[in-house]
Amino acid sequence: GISGRHSITVTTVASAGNIGEDGILSCTFEPDIKLSDIVIQWLKEGVLGLVHEFKEGKDELSEQDEMFRGRTAVFADQVIVGNASLRLKNVQLTDAGTYKCYIITSKGKGNANLEYKTGAFSMPEVNVDYNASSETLRCEAPRWFPQPTVVWASQVDQGANFSEVSNTSFELNSENVTMKVVSVLYNVTINNTYSCMIENDIAKATGDIKVTESEIKRRSHLQLLNSK
């Protein structure tokens, strides 16, 4: 049976959701040896109904809030080993907020809060713009929100300010929330590595390009800023 007399350790990790895509809100707990003794409840600050409930080995969604209907799941196969993470389908801007992962097992009960940020972030791609009159690089990233900053850097001219020789534009995407980021860097020199860095309060992404006489090398990297 479920006693819930003692406190158990529940651990969450602050995370970010990419709107329009599926997200995961991480939560782990001290495992129990019997699935039927585990109850997982996900709650959100300011939301009346439950986000998700999993008990006696299955989802119990009778008290689920309308805004989460048909959009949540847990990794049921992993609950027995202490994984209570919530899967969230089609992340919305309004899903941002403070969530509570509340666990009851035969060993006791415990909870932990999690800050969930939502926005849009994508990997940039840097290309040589052959249509331009001078040597030009074009950095494009399809989906960002909130509006990010774009900074160019180069390996040769470290610390140089490229704002005078670059131009950045933001084009609203069809869903009227996220934006396409396009930044152009002029007067580039050969045998140099240039980096296009896009950043907002959720994510930081970098697209690198190295242009030599014989080849072009590219590399991209994306990092969520609030993930510990």
Epitope: L35, K58, V74, A76, D77, V81
Partner: antibody
Framework: QVQLQQSGAELMKPGASVKISCKAS????????MHWVKQSHGKSLEWVGY????????SYNQKFKGKATLTVDKSSSTAYMHLSSLTSEDSGVYYC????????WGQGTLVTVSA | DIVMTQSPSSMYASLGERVTITCKAS??????LSWYQQKPWKSPKTLIY???SLADGVPSRFSGSGSGQDFSLTISSLESDDTATYYC?????????FGGGTKLEIK
């Protein structure tokens, strides 16, 4: 208790295709992966693959890639396995199942491939 | 692929006897192992999940132990209803693989 109800037995000609269904009752369909398992007559069990009802993602045993296609219909809490280009080697009982945790199994669907 | 070697492949035991079936994985699968009981013309029934957890409705005479590569299913006191074929399954790494089965009959 979660019940998994499978469709009835199928007698098929070589070269034909068949689609087997597995309907889950008394639970929300998205938290468990739905696995499919084959049992040839008098033999052990073979894992075919699973479908993740949350996003439709799949994982297959290499042996069944190109032979089996796993899908789900969340609105009816039903999983499907489509078997193509049937040969006598595909004859057997196919089970849908939740493998880990509350591991329930369907009653099985007998597929017989015969000219 | 991970190979699950189950032994014995068949055995006879007396009522009330303690019976142990083993499964050895070709590599570490932690505790990602389940045990199933199958009777003729029936679908498998889960006995043990995650190596040691007893499935709901399964008599307490069944128990599972082990982790890593070596696992066992024990029936503490054999009953006539336990005549069946028993299978282990590793679900630690894709493709999931079953043992060859152990056919258990009463002496």
């Amino acid at each position: 208790q979660v019940q998994l109800q499978q469709s009835g037995a199928e007698l098929m000609k070589p070269g034909a295709s068949v689609k087997i269904s597995c309907k889950a009752s008394d639970y929300s369909f998205t938290s468990y992966y739905m696995h499919w398992v084959k049992q040839s007559h008098g033999k052990s069990l073979e894992w075919v693959g699973y479908v993740d009802p949350f996003n439709g993602g799949t994982s297959y045993n290499q042996k069944f890639k190109g032979k089996a296609t796993l899908t789900v219909d969340k609105s009816s809490s039903t999983a499907y396995m489509h078997l193509s280009s049937l040969t006598s080697e595909d004859s057997g009982v196919y089970y849908c199942a939740f493998i880990a945790g509350f591991a329930n199994w369907g009653q099985g669907t007998l597929v017989t491939v015969s000219a | 692929d991970i190979v699950m070697t189950q032994s014995p492949s068949s055995m006879y035991a007396s009522l009330g006897e303690r019976v142990t079936i083993t499964c050895k994985a070709s590599q570490d699968i932690k505790s990602y192992l389940s045990w199933y009981q199958q009777k003729p013309w029936k679908s498998p029934k889960t006995l043990i999940y995650y190596a040691t957890s007893l499935a709901d409705g399964v008599p307490s005479r069944f128990s599972g132990s082990g982790s890593g590569q070596d696992f066992s299913l024990t029936i503490s006191s054999l009953e006539s209803d336990d005549t069946a074929t028993y299978y282990c399954l590793q679900h630690g790494e894709s493709p999931y693989t079953f043992g060859g089965g152990t056919k258990l009959e009463i002496k």
